[in-house]
Every structure is written in structure tokens, then in C-alpha cells.
């Protein structure tokens, strides 16, 4: 080994990664909100829709104060990976009725993938547990009908919207603890 020499700073650090994750989450939230509104315009929803395969909402108003960095990042990553799988499934199996939303769904998927990479980098830099907790992966079969795929899209976008809304709040709170 040679004599001690300083290294130049790399282009980001954990706090910058967290800032970047917040910006990406906000941007994804705006995209999701816009796409959900488009869905409601084109295919009005008759009440709330749900899908058994979607993750349950990780946070509530009461739990925000007790959030811990590892738990939030791990859970957020697991949930977003699930939503990514569902968006991919929608694009693949959504049928002709959802084909008109293909460009928006494609952009949404790309943004989700980017946010997941940023979260992974943040977790790596902090040396937090990387392995996602084992969760049963519910196989996603083809929708029963055209209306089934529309209901699924409403459920996926609605759930993703709620998840991202809490993610922004949670990540902003975590910023103060890093």
C-alpha cells in the first residue's frame, strides 16, 4: 500500500441519496395521481377496488412518529417491488382497453424501477439489511374480463398512490434522523 492519499468525494452520499429518493417519490406520486385521474375519466370507478395480491398499507398517521430507518426502507422497497410486478402485469395482461394508457404505464414502470435502484443504493450505503423479507408471491393470473383488468388498474394505482403518499412523509421524517 502506498502513502495515505485523500479520495475525491463521490457524486452522492447517503443523505443526498435520501434527498434523491424523496424527489423521485414525489415525482412518481404526481405521475400516479395523474394516471389515476386519467383512469377515472376514461373508465369511471364504481366505488373502491381492491386486489388481494397488493401489499397492505405499511404506515398510518399514528405510526409516523415511531418510524425507524431500516424498517421503513425495507418495507417501502418490498411494497414498491410488489407494485412494480403489478404494473408489469397490467402492461402485459391488461387487454385492449388499457392499451391506450400504455405510454403512461411504461413511464410509470421506468420511474418505479429508478426509485427502487435509488432505495437500494441508499440501503447499501447505510449497510442496512438488503434481503427483502420472505413474502408469499401471489401469482397474478390473467384478468377474468376487460372490466376485471380495469378494476385491477384502479386498485393498483389507488394503492400505489397511498403507498407513495406515506413514503414521502416517512422519508422526509427519516431525513431528520440521518
Amino acid at each position: 500500500p502506498g502513502p495515505p492519499a485523500g479520495s475525491p468525494r463521490v457524486s452522492s452520499d447517503p443523505r443526498a441519496d435520501l434527498d434523491s429518493a424523496v424527489l423521485l417519490t414525489r415525482s412518481l406520486l404526481a405521475d400516479t395521481r395523474q394516471l389515476a385521474a386519467q383512469m377515472r375519466d376514461k373508465f369511471p370507478a364504481d366505488g373502491d377496488h381492491s386486489l388481494d395480491s397488493l401489499p397492505t398499507l405499511a404506515m398510518s398517521a399514528g405510526t409516523l412518529g415511531s418510524l425507524q430507518l431500516p424498517g421503513v426502507l425495507t418495507r417501502l422497497r418490498v411494497d414498491l417491488m410488489s407494485y412494480l410486478r403489478h404494473v408489469q402485469w397490467l402492461r402485459r395482461a391488461g387487454g385492449p382497453s388499457l392499451k391506450t394508457l400504455e405510454p403512461e404505464l411504461g413511464a410509470l414502470q421506468a420511474r418505479l424501477e429508478r426509485l427502487l435502484r435509488r432505495l437500494q443504493l441508499l440501503m447499501s450505503r447505510l449497510a442496512l439489511p438488503q434481503a427483502a423479507p420472505d413474502q408469499p408471491v401471489i401469482p397474478l393470473g390473467p384478468p377474468a374480463s376487460a372490466w376485471g383488468s380495469i378494476r385491477a388498474a384502479h386498485a393498483i394505482l389507488g394503492g400505489l398512490h397511498l403507498t407513495l403518499d406515506w413514503a414521502v412523509r416517512g422519508l422526509l421524517l427519516l431525513k431528520t434522523r440521518l
Partner: antibody, heavy 114, light 111 residues
Framework: EVQLLESGGGLVQPGGSLRLSCAAS????????MHWVRQAPGKGLEWVSV????????YYADSVKGRFTISRDNSKNTLYLQMNSLRAEDTAVYYC???????WGQGTLVTVSS | QSVLTQPPSASGTPGQRVTISCTGS?????????VHWYQQLPGTAPKLLIY???ERPSGVPDRFSGSKSGTSASLAISGLRSEDEADYYC???????????FGGGTKLTVL
Amino acid sequence: EVQLLESGGGLVQPGGSLRLSCAASGFTFSSYGMHWVRQAPGKGLEWVSVISYDGSYKYYADSVKGRFTISRDNSKNTLYLQMNSLRAEDTAVYYCAAGVFDYWGQGTLVTVSS
Amino acid sequence: QSVLTQPPSASGTPGQRVTISCTGSSSNIGAGYDVHWYQQLPGTAPKLLIYSNNERPSGVPDRFSGSKSGTSASLAISGLRSEDEADYYCAAWDDSLNGPVFGGGTKLTVL
């Protein structure tokens, strides 16, 4: 400018112990997970251990599990590696590194020999 | 035997483009984990070259680029220079080992 400076290496007999230190400066040490990586003479890099930014998570390579202990003192910006029951195959240059190995120290040589 | 497999050596002439591969498995690269690349010049400590598959730290020339697909990744160096002669390592998290793993390293020779 970021600096990581390892110390504590040297010659030790098989079965002996050493404690390596890594003093950090020029970046927010308490925001980074920290690693120890070693490189035997003429060989490739081998990851040894990692500790999370706040010290709550620690992981070890199978080859050192139960013999080496990683720790950190964020108030002193210092990372440690306590090495016990040393073997000849632990002979290597030991580097400390931050984050996704964003920054590396220059290394300290540990020689285990009788 | 490294968990991530790299060719032991690679070579090229100045100005040429060379590619170094890094092959993993379903517990590391294939599990979706990012790949990072490091350069180790003779007699010095390694240095971060590419992180998160294709991102360059400040100060790293754009001649260096990374990509990832499936269970493998690659590092490309274009406009090869004599100062690029070094050992190159890839790394990724591995679920089965619960820690990061390095490739065996590739010695790049500029002819």
C-alpha cells in the same frame, strides 16, 4: 478531501490477536455503513465484514465468523476490527471502505506467521 | 472460486474499446442487486469506478461505462489509454452469503 487511515497491522503468531483501527475524515462518517476488505498477497479482494451506519447491523464473511468482531465509534469517526484466533490464511492487506466501497483507505498489512 | 465470475485477463491497444464481464447468479446480480466496479492501479488501494450498474462518480471519465442484464454485468472502456492498465473488480450484494461479494478480478493490459 476524504481520508481513511488504517492502523494496527503487523506481525502476529498463529492463534494471536490484533485490533485494527480506521480513522475517517472529510465525510459524514456516521451516515455511512463501513466495511473491512482484505487482499492476500497477489490475490483478489475479499470482503470481511460490514457494520451499518449506526452500528445496529453487523455481517461477517464465513471465513472470519466467530473470530473477528467489527465495531465503530461515531463520536470518534473511527472503525475497528478485533481479530482473534488468527491463522496463516488471514495474512493480507486490510482495507477499510465506506458505503458501496465509495472510499478506501490505503490498507494495513497483517502477517500471521510463526 | 469467486461467487462473481470475471475473466482473469483482458487486453487491448491504445484507442481500442474493451469490455470486461461479470457473471453472477440468482442470489446476487439476478436477484436485482446493483453491480459496482472498482479499479486498482498497481500498488494502490482500489477506487470506485462505476456504482449502481451504470453511474459514474465525479472525476471518472465518461470513457468508462457499465451495464447490467439478467445475471451478468459488464464494464466497457473506450478509447483505451496506457494509464487504464490495472485490475478491475465487480461487486454486488449476495442474499445467500448475507454480504457483498467481489469478482475474482480482471487484469487489463494495454499493449
